[in-house]
């Protein structure tokens, strides 16, 4: 995303070659003031030394126009045109293309597999604790507690289908009512959006890429949070989801269907089951207060078992516990009865890595968490690199136009709805909204898809995952069919309601604006992305959980003032931006508050102090790895390498820390762009050059 046109021979910084250049009056008052306050001296020039001439023409074109950081970057084609290639070159190009496609599919495959393993890792680390959240009896009476349990459990197990299936089994066994289950499902919907936000963090190396990727990922979060903010109170007041879904379930005479088709899993399962296999029933059993399950391992050891039913004599406390009076007897002291007992005979062990290690679940979980995050990160980097090399020139133009262009007038409004359908269809194919949205994230980052287009695709993904749940519900056994179908329909109608709230009218597309705002903040202060993740997905839910356990009075006592302050701040912010004259002078800005309460700068300084010592060694490692990678891939020397390091170096340069001399392949334009603070050319340079 070059801030101004580049010329091969244009000197990156003309001011260095026009010494003593000053200007009495800046041409671009906004940006130049902001970015170069220190140089704003009004002293006349005394010395004018001519240095070798460099073309600065390109640097003063339209000086007042600043690129919108949300505009898609132009992916320039540096290669030779197809028509200019000879036969050998064309064949080589075709093979390169095929090779890249194979590599792309390969990395995409491992990317999806690592997401699956990541989910397993989270379940091993936090699954049992997540299961215990469900066994809390207050869920029945407190929808807010249900909501945060849904969020926390889904975040801990990294799978909304796991938390939903626990809810289904609890409803089926009457441990939970459908009414109490609905907030949990809403929470699960929020929790599942953490995955693509984690994936977006992997693109932190490039500011502009990160801005787009993070905003593209968090648009899902904001949609879910906002939907819950509106629909949970509506549901508590009217129970519309419960009533509507009950009417649907009762009006149909469902028969058990076929199993929901496993589409993507067919390809990924053979690989992921070699890594680890989990016994998902354990979490459900813990949720249903099964004491024996607490000591069971989630790691599956026996994959082939034979379950035999046998009649067994067992003692019972009294005759009332007998299966039937005729099947009851005494040995003179104890009462005995005959019961059908199923016993499992282990036949064959599973074939995964951890089957013979007998490590505790936490250890296996941590190992897998580290490995899957590394693989996820590596695959993502490689996908972005390959896509970057493929999506250039004509290809990029075609793809970007296809994805981001609207239908011709008057059908332009239909484009978004088609995108919703595409998102739903794709999610249905991959059988996971996390996989689809996570695959979408790097595409948003590199600028193939706009956030405006990613938004309906994400909404469609939310619908797609519920259709999968409905199919799975229809395939469930008779005893759970009704409850699982009703819960799947609740999930479906919740997402439909959310779409109706936050999509049809462009003005109501708040999630896009909020995500862009967060994207801008996170691009400037990258630590804020992790901060956001921790606060929204862990701290807030855990706080609400803790307060809910303390009881309604405590929850209301703490919650009401907090909500009041938030509303007050939002109203004040709205008035400040729309009609500040209504407010007293003191309230027209936030300066009346301490700096740390209205700016992230002081916090940034504190965090930089703590993370500083780790940055340079990390960057050296990053740079070495990147160079090696460039050598292996045969990238040109100008490849965008170690962007995070360039940012760091620029920051140190500004503070007067000597950094290595710029090399021929250190593209300043790119590093400026990476900083996310696209600057207009320095006014002083412009005037002197003119």
């Amino acid at each position: 995303m070059a801030p101004w046109p580049e010329l091969g021979d244009a000197q990156p910084n003309p001011s260095k070659y026009l010494e003593g250049a000053t200007s009495q009056q800046p041409i671009t008052p906004d940006k130049s003031k902001e970015t170069n306050k220190t140089d704003n001296t009004e002293v006349p020039v005394t010395k004018f030394e001519l240095l070798p001439t460099y073309s600065t023409a390109t640097l003063i074109e339209e000086p007042t126009e600043v690129d919108d950081p949300w505009n898609l970057p132009t992916l320039q084609d540096s290669g030779i045109k197809w028509s200019e290639r000879d036969a050998k070159g064309k064949i080589l190009c075709v093979f390169q293309g095929i090779g890249r496609l194979i590599l792309l599919l390969g990395f995409l495959y491992f990317f999806v597999c690592s997401l699956d393993v990541l989910s397993s890792a989270f379940q091993l680390v936090g699954g049992k604790m997540a299961g215990q959240f469900f066994s809390n009896s207050s869920i029945m009476s407190n929808p807010l507690l249900g909501l945060v349990i849904g969020v926390l459990v889904t975040v801990f197990v990294q799978s909304s289908s796991t938390s939903t299936s626990i809810v289904v089994s609890m409803v089926a066994s009457s441990l939970l009512t459908v009414r109490a289950a609905i907030p949990i499902i809403m929470g699960a919907n929020i929790g599942t959006s953490i995955t693509n936000t984690i994936v977006a963090l992997m693109q932190v190396g490039d500011r502009s890429e990160f801005r787009r990727a993070f905003a593209g990922a968090t648009v899902h979060d904001f949609f879910n949070w906002l939907s819950v903010l509106v629909l949970l109170p509506v549901e508590v007041a009217t129970h519309y989801l419960e009533v509507v879904t009950q009417l649907i379930v009762e009006s149909f005479h469902f028969k058990n269907g076929e199993d929901a088709p496993d589409l993507l899993k067919v390809i990924t399962k053979p690989f992921t089951k070699l890594i680890v296999q989990l016994d998902k029933k354990v979490i459900s059993q813990i949720a249903m207060n099964d004491e024996t399950a607490k000591n069971k391992s989630l790691v599956k050891i026996w994959c082939k078992t034979f379950t035999n039913m046998t009649q067994m004599n067992v003692t019972v406390p009294s005759m009332a516990n007998c299966t039937s009076p005729s099947l009851c007897w005494t040995d003179g002291i104890q009462i005995w009865t005959m019961k059908n007992v199923t016993y499992k005979e282990n036949i064959a062990k599973c074939q995964h890595i951890f089957v013979n290690f007998h490590l505790p679940d936490l250890a296996v979980g941590i190992i897998l968490l580290i490995i899957s995050l590394l693989v996820l990160c590596g695959c993502l980097i490689m996908i972005v690199k390959i896509l970057g090399s493929v999506l250039k020139g004509q290809v990029a133009t075609v793809i970007k136009k296809t994805i981001n262009t609207d239908f011709p007038f008057p059908f332009a409004w239909l484009t978004g709805y088609l995108a919703i359908l595409v998102g739903a269809g794709m999610t249905f194919i991959v059988q996971s909204s996390s996989v689809f949205t996570s695959a979408l994230t790097p595409l948003i980052g590199i600028g193939v898809i706009t956030i405006e287009r990613a938004y309906p695709l994400t909404l469609g993904s939310n619908i797609g995952t519920t259709t999968t749940a409905i199919l799975a519900a229809l395939a469930s056994p008779g005893n759970t069919l009704r409850s699982s179908l009703q819960i799947a329909l609740c999930h479906f109608f919740f997402n439909i309601s959310g779409i109706l709230l936050w999509y049809p009218i462009p003005f109501t597309r708040l999630p896009i604006r909020m995500a862009k705002g967060l994207g801008n903040i996170s691009a400037k202060y990258r630590w804020f992305a992790i901060f956001y993740l921790i606060i929204f997905f862990f701290l807030i839910p855990l706080t609400v959980f803790g307060l809910s356990l303390a009881g309604w009075p405590v929850l209301v006592g703490v919650g009401v003032p907090v909500v009041f302050i938030i509303i007050l701040v939002l109203c004040l912010r709205l008035l400040q931006s729309r009609c500040p004259r209504v407010l007293p002078k003191k309230l027209q800005n936030w300066n009346f508050l301490p700096l740390c309460m209205h700016s992230l700068k002081p916090w940034d300084a504190v965090i930089s102090k703590f993370t500083g010592p780790f940055q340079m060694p990390c960057c050296c490692c990053c740079r070495v790895c990147c160079r090696v990678c460039c050598l292996l891939c045969g990238c040109p020397k100008c490849c965008r390498c170690s962007k995070c390091c360039q940012d760091l170096e620029e920051g140190q340069e500004a503070q007067g820390v000597p950094v290595k001399a710029p090399e021929t392949f250190d593209n300043i334009t790119i590093s400026r762009e990476a900083q996310g603070e696209v600057r207009a050319p320095d006014s002083k340079t412009e005037c002197t050059a003119l």
Partner: antibody, heavy 119, light 107 residues
Framework: QVQLVQSGAEVKKPGASVKVSCKTS????????MHWVRQAPGQGLEWIGA????????AYNQKFKGRVTMTADTSTSTVYMELSSLRSEDTAVYYC????????????WGQGTLVTVSS | DIQLTQSPSFLSASVGDRVTITCKAS??????VAWYQQKPGKAPKLLIY???TRHSGVPSRFSGSGSGTEFTLTISSLQPEDFATYYC?????????FGQGTKLEIK
């Protein structure tokens, strides 16, 4: 092989107590219940109660409750049955019998102890 | 308490005869019934348990049948050593109870 050897015959006065022993061998003493059954002269069999030597748990026929006490000594693999407040109608042959595991059939019996109650 | 009534109380038969003794329970006892043989001056000996299962070492001429409230002990071919008193017992519930006995004599 399983053997149950009971103590010898006893003659008691009304109101007195009698303690009959039953020494077992040939099996794991703590795994099976031990029953006590009596048979009055020329009459049928009557169940008095049972003891589980493993835990010392007992169950008595309501008819004898308050008068009967059953104990087990695991060190000698012996069970005891004490009947107090003897009456003339308590004159009978008292048998100890091993209960089959898991139900109330009695597979091995002692030779019996004749208790005579007379003034 | 569950009452067990045996019939007949006395039975005369010859060697080689097929003999059937009946035991009726006052309420459903399932199959929790055992049969014993007792010879004068001796302790009872277990023949059948669970209404139909022969105890180890018991000759095959002894068989049991029935469930619920009616049970039978059948001796297919009487042998000289079979002349004794036979008792049925229920262990469906406490207290364990026995029938009054059926005395089998030589005709």
């Amino acid at each position: 092989q399983v053997q149950l050897v009971q103590s010898g015959a006893e003659v008691k006065k009304p109101g007195a107590s009698v303690k009959v022993s039953c020494k077992t061998s040939g099996y794991t003493f703590t795994t099976n219940n031990m029953h006590w059954v009596r048979q009055a002269p020329g009459q049928g069999l009557e169940w008095i109660g049972a003891i589980y030597p493993g835990s010392g748990a007992t169950a008595y026929n309501q008819k004898f409750k308050g008068r009967v006490t059953m104990t087990a000594d695991t060190s000698t693999s012996t069970v005891y049955m004490e009947l107090s407040s003897l009456r003339s109608e308590d004159t009978a042959v008292y048998y100890c019998a091993r209960g089959m595991y898991g139900h109330g059939a009695m597979d091995y019996w002692g030779q019996g102890t004749l208790v005579t109650v007379s003034s | 308490d569950i009452q067990l009534t045996q019939s007949p109380s006395f039975l005369s038969a010859s060697v080689g005869d097929r003999v059937t003794i009946t035991c009726k329970a006052s309420q459903d006892v399932g199959t929790a019934v055992a049969w014993y043989q007792q010879k004068p001056g001796k302790a009872p000996k277990l023949l059948i348990y669970w209404a139909t299962t022969r105890h180890s070492g018991v000759p095959s001429r002894f068989s049991g049948s029935g469930s619920g409230t009616e049970f039978t002990l059948t001796i297919s071919s009487l042998q000289p050593e079979d002349f004794a008193t036979y008792y049925c017992q229920q262990y469906s519930s406490n207290p364990l109870t026995f029938g009054q006995g059926t005395k089998l004599e030589i005709k």
